[in-house]
Each structure stands twice: as structure tokens, then as C-alpha cells.
């Protein structure tokens, strides 16, 4: 396997993770794919300290994170447990609002202008943050 010991160019290192902050928007699924192509994942917020770090870098802009409930319960994309983990929802959120008229509810979480979280329609083209961990062994798949 291989280990990443330093962050790629244009990524920001913080607490043994690397972060990349987009400056354009994509739908949640497209942002997720972008991160995966970079051997990363949409940001998973595990502490108040990490929340403040991300919030500082994104500013007051709606920004996707790696949290969704498209298959029922809320899940972090890296498998981090949602129920016992850090949360920073806005009051009354998540509300799975259907009143937007776009069809369905709201299944993807994003940072709002004050940093707190909201659920929204996954197709909205918001900015996003990718995260990858340093020193995380990555076994290359066998060649077929």
C-alpha cells in the first residue's frame, strides 16, 4: 500500500487531514464524485474545532459536506457514526422540507452562511469541501 505523508498542491493541511475548498458549485453527487476522483471524500466534521476550521475557510457561503440521508437515516460518507458524532444543525433543522417545489424533500447537508448546518435539495449547485486523511494506508486494488 501507499501512504500520503503531505498534502497535495492547493490543499490545506489541518490536524493530519488535507482539505480542498472549491470555488465553483456542483450538485452534491457531482461534488462527491469530484472528491472520490481525488482519492478523498466530502468533508466529515467530527469536532467543534474542525467545524471552526472549515467555517473559516469557506466563509458565509452555502457549502456541501459529506452528510446525507438519501437512503433513510443520516450518514457520513466515510462511515463515521452520525448518532454519536458531532452535529451543528440550525434550529429546526434538518426538516426535509418539501415546499421548495423541486420534487422530493431535502437529503443533503450543507454549511449555511453562519456555518451551522441545513438540509437541502441535493441538486443545488453549491460549493463543497474535500477531505483526505494523512498517513492513511491505501491498498491499491489488484490488477485484473
Amino acid at each position: 500500500g501507499s501512504e500520503r505523508t503531505c498534502c497535495p498542491v492547493n490543499w490545506v493541511e489541518h490536524e493530519r487531514s488535507c482539505y480542498w475548498f472549491s470555488r465553483s458549485g456542483k450538485a452534491w453527487a457531482d461534488a462527491d464524485n469530484y472528491c472520490r476522483l481525488e482519492d478523498a471524500h466530502l468533508v466529515v466534521v467530527t469536532s467543534w474545532e474542525e467545524q471552526k476550521f472549515v467555517q473559516h475557510h469557506i466563509g458565509p457561503v452555502n457549502t456541501w459536506m459529506g452528510l446525507h440521508d438519501q437512503n433513510g437515516p443520516w450518514k457520513w460518507v466515510d462511515g463515521t457514526d452520525y448518532e454519536t458524532g458531532f452535529k451543528n444543525w440550525r434550529p429546526e433543522q434538518p426538516d426535509d422540507w418539501y415546499g421548495h417545489g423541486l420534487g422530493g424533500g431535502e437529503d443533503c447537508a450543507h454549511f449555511t452562511d453562519d456555518g451551522r448546518w441545513n438540509d437541502d435539495v441535493c441538486q443545488r449547485p453549491y460549493r463543497w469541501v474535500c477531505e483526505t486523511e494523512l498517513d492513511k494506508a491505501s491498498q491499491e486494488p489488484p490488477l485484473l
Epitope: 472520490r36 482519492d39 486494488p141
Partner: antibody, heavy 118, light 107 residues
Framework: EVQLLESGGGLVQPGGSLRLSCAAS????????MSWVRQAPGKGLEWVSA????????FDADSVKGRFTISRDNSKNTLYLQMNSLRAEDTAVYYC???????????WGQGTLVTVSS | DIQMTQSPSSVSASVGDRVTITCRAS??????LAWYQQKPGKAPRLLIY???SLQSGVPSRFSGSGSGTDFTLTISNLQPEDFATYYC?????????FGQGTKVEIK
């Protein structure tokens, strides 16, 4: 200097298999996603498959899903495309391409021709 | 899939002319668009990425603009080496898709 050199193309019968290779040099291969893009004779460009730098994540066009497999060996700086169940419509020049941030192709190989015919 | 439609399919121009090629996406792609140049028998060459950023080594007579669904590649002061086929490509969503190409021919 970045160089990408494809090989493995040739004439194959419908239903047959072929494995294309792309030897890379001049950059840190494992740090970049790579893609295969094809171009049928006299036609436009069609993206085929992409793979992340470590080879963990792959993405495929619907037209090749389940038939083609993209892979890489970072110890050999080589990208592969395993092509199975080939069809006449797969006939094309196949290019490997290095991706820059944003998934744009900043370097391309010279291409290798795959002809599927009986 | 996102469809990319280029116009015109071909254009005849003279050295020194200003040539404009347009590319329209079937849905919004923000600025996730690139332009490539391809000459017969050769691999494509990246000219513009992010809709308007000039790739290193590409002459400044090439410029790109647009956002959302409508994009433009402009070649000002067309040079002999610019006669080629030009493709747009979106990387907003998988599968990444290309326009059908615009051939710039000598008048």
C-alpha cells in the same frame, strides 16, 4: 517532460478481448487521476473511463460499463484498459490522458487504434 | 447525461480573422468547461479550462468565456497553425461529455 505512450491496440473479432496499456513518465504518476478517451474514425471525442490516483475509485461511461475495466499499477507508472466483449462500435483510436485539477485533460498520449471486425 | 452542442459545425476563415465558436450545455455546468484543439492524426491539446483560464503555453489569442449553459471560444488574429477542429468538454457531471466539434478551415 510529461509523456504518455499507449500500446496494445490492434485488430480483434467481435466478442473478443484486448488490454491497452499507457506508460507514463515525467510526472508523479500516483498523484494524478487518469482517463481513457476514444475517437471513432472521422468522429468526435468520447470519454470512456477514469481512475483516481491511487486506483481506489473508478468511473465509466454507460457504453462500456460491465465490459471495460480501467486500472493502474503505480509501481510501474502504467495505466490499463481491459476491454472485453468488444463490439464493432468500439472501433476507435484510444487515448490515455492525464487529468489536472477540475478533471480537464492537460496531457494526452498519441493514441492506439483498436479495430473490432470479423 | 449532459449534452454539449457546438456551433457552427464548421467555419471558413482567413489568417488574421477573429473566429468565435459557441458551446451550449443541456443543463447548467457552472464553469466546468474546457476547450481542446485537435489537428488531423494528432491528440487533442488543452487550450482553456474552467471556461476562461488559459492553459500554460497556449497563445493569448485564444480566450474563453461563459458560465452556466452558454460558452464561447474566441480566436483573435487567426494564425495558419490554428486551422484545426475544436471541441468543448464538460466536467461538471459524469459521464464527461464533449461537443461534436467545430472545424476551422481556410477560406
Amino acid at each position: 517532460e510529461v509523456q504518455l505512450l499507449e500500446s496494445g491496440g490492434g485488430l480483434v473479432q467481435p466478442g473478443g478481448s484486448l488490454r491497452l496499456s499507457c506508460a507514463a513518465s515525467g510526472f508523479t504518476f500516483s498523484s494524478y487521476a487518469m482517463s481513457w478517451v476514444r475517437q471513432a474514425p472521422g468522429k468526435g471525442l468520447e470519454w470512456v473511463s477514469a481512475i483516481s490516483g491511487r486506483g481506489v475509485n473508478t468511473f465509466d461511461a454507460d457504453s462500456v460499463k460491465g465490459r471495460f475495466t480501467i486500472s493502474r499499477d503505480n509501481s510501474k507508472n502504467t495505466l490499463y484498459l481491459q476491454m472485453n466483449s468488444l463490439r464493432a462500435e468500439d472501433t476507435a483510436v484510444y487515448y490515455c490522458a492525464k487529468e489536472r485539477s477540475g478533471s480537464y485533460f492537460d496531457y494526452w498520449g498519441q493514441g492506439t487504434l483498436v479495430t473490432v471486425s470479423s | 447525461d449532459i449534452q454539449m452542442t457546438q456551433s457552427p459545425s464548421s467555419v471558413s476563415a482567413s489568417v488574421g480573422d477573429r473566429v468565435t465558436i459557441t458551446c451550449r450545455a443541456s443543463q447548467g455546468i457552472s464553469d466546468w468547461l474546457a476547450w481542446y484543439q485537435q489537428k488531423p492524426g494528432k491528440a487533442p491539446r488543452l487550450l482553456i479550462y474552467g471556461a476562461s483560464s488559459l492553459q500554460s503555453g497556449v497563445p493569448s489569442r485564444f480566450s474563453g468565456s461563459g458560465s452556466g449553459t452558454d460558452f464561447t471560444l474566441t480566436i483573435s488574429n487567426l494564425q495558419p497553425e490554428d486551422f484545426a477542429t475544436y471541441y468543448c468538454q464538460q466536467t461538471n457531471s459524469f459521464p464527461w461529455t464533449f461537443g461534436q466539434g467545430t472545424k476551422v478551415e481556410i477560406k
